[in-house]
């Protein structure tokens, strides 16, 4: 398809690595949030760290290539990695413009889907790259 | 700084595979950037031809993507193209060009290829 | 594909000239107001230079003389002053939608 996918690019302040390189910051005349036009995919991720009491972005932005998922139109995560006990990282892919600026719904955590709190422990910077 | 350099053979017989290779040094072709295959034709017009990004998705234009292929040898920093069931319009300057984003910072040489029995 | 129409397709000017090139797209290669138009300088026997990068952006070490400007559809290359060594042709190239596409060229000679 001729038309290149924009999404919504945040990086939290601290995560290791960057996807900045995956797509052209563009100027949208505010701060916040930033946008990014994909160069190698028409796909956005989004990852959110769900604790007890809440959800977090930990980053936004293009994948580096069309994959299963991203022919989503909305960002409907999934539980993919435990970065510290009590928390859980979910993603999403999507394939829609700025798809990725909220997702649909978070299930509760520790509810059935959740990776089980004997799951995966990563640091904090490693377990964003287990999720991507 | 980021350098590429074009090869291969100068005259390809119609109907057979055209093959040119690209050194790239200065830049690890797996680290960042799309690299591309662009051509000029005799009366200077330019088309992109497509690329191979760093982690070795292919994109390719439309108008070649029956005919193209793009590869690499990320132990040797080079990428190939190979066109096939070239015709005499295939006679061009070929060039392969690195680019960060969606517009080419570096360009090789250029390495012309003329098709003819 | 869209198509990119570059005017006029040659000139002559003189050292010290304005001169000015213009590119139309078939269609806009805006996207969410940022424009994807891009502008080269090729000399015979050589590679394209890229000049300017997102319709007004001025490629490091390119001499201040060169400016972009337009947006859309409509696009211009302003070169200030002529100098010797800018007899050359000018492409400009739009990455709004894939695939990427050229314009024809602009040979700027000497009067």
């Known amino acids: 398809p001729p038309n290149r996918r924009t999404c919504v690019f945040f990086e939290a302040p601290g995560v290791r690595g960057s996807t900045k390189t995956l797509g052209e910051l563009l100027d949208t005349g505010t701060e916040l949030p930033r946008a990014i036009r994909c160069l190698y995919s028409r796909c956005c991720f989004g990852i959110w760290n769900l604790t007890q009491d809440r959800a977090q972005v930990e980053m936004q932005g293009c994948r580096d290539s069309d994959e299963p998922g991203c022919e989503s139109l909305h960002c409907d995560p999934s539980p993919r990695a435990h970065p510290s006990p009590g928390s859980t990282l979910f993603t999403c892919s999507c394939g829609t413009d700025f798809c990725n600026a909220n997702y649909s719904h978070l299930p509760p955590p520790g509810s059935p889907g959740t990776p089980g709190s004997q799951g995966p422990q990563a640091a904090p910077g490693e377990s964003i790259w287990m999720a991507l | 700084q980021v350098q590429l350099q074009e090869s291969g053979p100068g005259l390809v017989k119609p109907s057979e595979t055209l093959s040119l290779t690209c050194t790239v040094s200065?830049?690890?072709?797996?680290?960042?950037?799309?690299w591309n295959w662009i051509r000029q034709f005799p009366g200077k017009g330019l088309e992109w031809m497509g690329y191979i990004s760093f982690s070795g998705s292919t994109s390719y234009n439309p108008s070649l993507k029956s005919r193209i292929t793009i590869s690499r040898d990320t132990s040797k920093n080079q990428f190939f193209l190979q066109l096939s069931s070239v015709t005499a319009e295939d006679t061009a300057v070929y060039y392969c060009?690195?680019?960060?984003?969606?517009?080419?910072?570096?360009w090789g040489q250029g390495t012309l290829v003329t098709v003819s029995s | 594909d869209i198509q990119m129409t570059q005017s006029p397709s040659s000139l002559s000017a003189s050292v010290g000239d304005r001169v000015t090139i213009t590119c139309r797209a078939s269609e806009s290669v805006d996207t969410y107001g940022n424009s994807f138009m891009h502008w080269y300088q090729q000399k015979p026997g050589k590679a394209p230079k890229l000049l300017i990068y997102r319709a007004s952006n001025l490629e490091s070490g390119v001499p201040s003389r060169f400016s972009g400007s337009g947006s859309g559809t409509d696009f211009t290359l302003t070169i200030s002053s002529l100098q010797p060594e800018d007899f050359a042709t000018y492409y400009c190239?739009?990455?709004?939608?894939?695939?990427?596409?050229f314009g024809g060229g602009t040979k700027v000679e000497i009067k």
């Open positions: 060009a690195g680019s960060r984003y969606s517009w080419f910072a570096y």
């Open positions: 190239q739009q990455s709004n939608e894939d695939p990427y596409t």
């Open positions: 200065g830049y690890s072709i797996t680290s960042d950037f799309a």
